[in-house]
């Protein structure tokens, strides 16, 4: 028989945690596991827990976490990878819409992250999209162009700045910006 | 809310004795590594020791501390200790306790800074000599 399969691992109530909040990680395997190993990725550090409780997330913290499991004298294959973001730890970039936050279907509209750092990552975050939009750029400012707008890209937007020198340690979040398709 | 409460500093003349002592409150205490490290001004926090929950209580002190200090845990009361003996005016410091919330699996893992989560305000100890 092959390896044990991998077990999955998940951030609640989300891997973007705002400085001194808590975030619970849980690694979840089949019934009957011996023992669970939860490691933090390039630190040396580990817990032979299925869950690690943070009572106050810290820059320490923050970093890419996986997990697996042992049955008899098997592991499992590793977790994917869960990347915790630490947010809060920069003042929040500014984000816009041009032309402006009110579009017509099948129109086009940029979103515009702004910040008065030198970073050079991006992220936005639709509210209720579990995946952000990433985008490297130079000049204190991302474009997030969205082609042939639907009515299913309305919606509460937020966007973050960080460093790709510190990929774990982003600002606070952008005031929301509230896209409407007419 | 996470707090490390550090007490016990204070002047002592060289060859003294002190006891600090460290309460923790909002962390789970018995399942993480808790440390003392000390800073002069103007100079990098500097690892003192480490006691963890592993085999009951693994501990480690600096080279510079061995033999003079002991750090130790009450796990029921969350509390950790550090007696500081035989004092001399190099170990004139702001002492800091730390906690980590996970272990360490490589060595000199656990004298790095960047391996602890929790830090306390720190309490001043001065040896007049």
């Known amino acids: 028989s092959g390896p044990l399969p991998k077990p999955s691992l998940q951030a609640l109530p989300s891997s973007l945690v705002p400085l001194e909040k808590p975030v619970t990680l849980r690694c979840q395997g089949p019934p009957g596991v011996d023992l669970y190993r939860l490691e933090k990725l390039s630190s040396s550090r580990y817990q032979d827990q299925a869950v690690l409780f943070i009572p106050a997330m810290k820059r320490s913290l923050a970093g890419r976490y996986r997990c697996s499991y042992q049955q008899g004298s098997l592991w499992s294959l590793p977790s994917d990878q869960l990347e915790l973001v630490a947010t809060g730890v920069f003042a929040k970039p500014s984000l816009s819409a041009q032309p402006g936050p009110a579009v017509s279907s099948g129109g086009d509209v940029t979103l515009q992250c702004q910040t008065r750092y030198g970073f050079d990552q991006f992220a936005l975050y639709k509210e209720g999209d579990p995946a952000p939009y990433k985008n490297p750029e130079r000049w204190y400012r991302a474009s997030f162009p969205i082609i042939t707008v639907t009515a299913a890209h309305s919606g509460t937007y937020r966007c973050y700045s960080f460093s790709s020198r510190d990929p774990y340690l982003w600002s606070a979040p952008s005031d929301p910006l509230e896209l409407v398709v007419t | 809310q996470v707090q490390l409460q550090e007490s016990g500093g204070g002047l002592v003349q060289a060859g003294g004795s002190l006891r600090l002592s460290c309460a923790a409150s909002?962390?789970?205490?018995?399942?993480?590594?808790m440390a003392w490290f000390r800073q002069v001004p103007g100079k990098e926090r500097e690892f003192v020791a480490v006691?963890?929950?592993?085999?009951?209580?693994?501990?480690d002190h600096a080279d510079s501390v061995k033999g003079r200090f002991l750090i130790s845990r009450d796990n029921a009361r969350h509390m950790v200790y550090l007696q500081m003996n035989s004092l001399n005016p190099e170990d004139t410091a702001v002492y800091y306790c730390?906690?980590?919330?996970?272990?360490?699996?490589?060595?000199?893992?656990?004298?790095?800074?960047?391996?602890?989560?929790?830090w306390g305000q720190g309490t001043q100890v001065t040896v007049s000599s």
């Open positions: 730390a906690s980590s919330l996970l272990y360490c699996s490589a060595s000199g893992c656990y004298a790095n800074r960047d391996s602890y989560d929790y």
């Open positions: 006691i963890s929950t592993e085999s009951g209580g693994r501990t």
């Open positions: 909002g962390v789970t205490f018995d399942s993480a590594a």
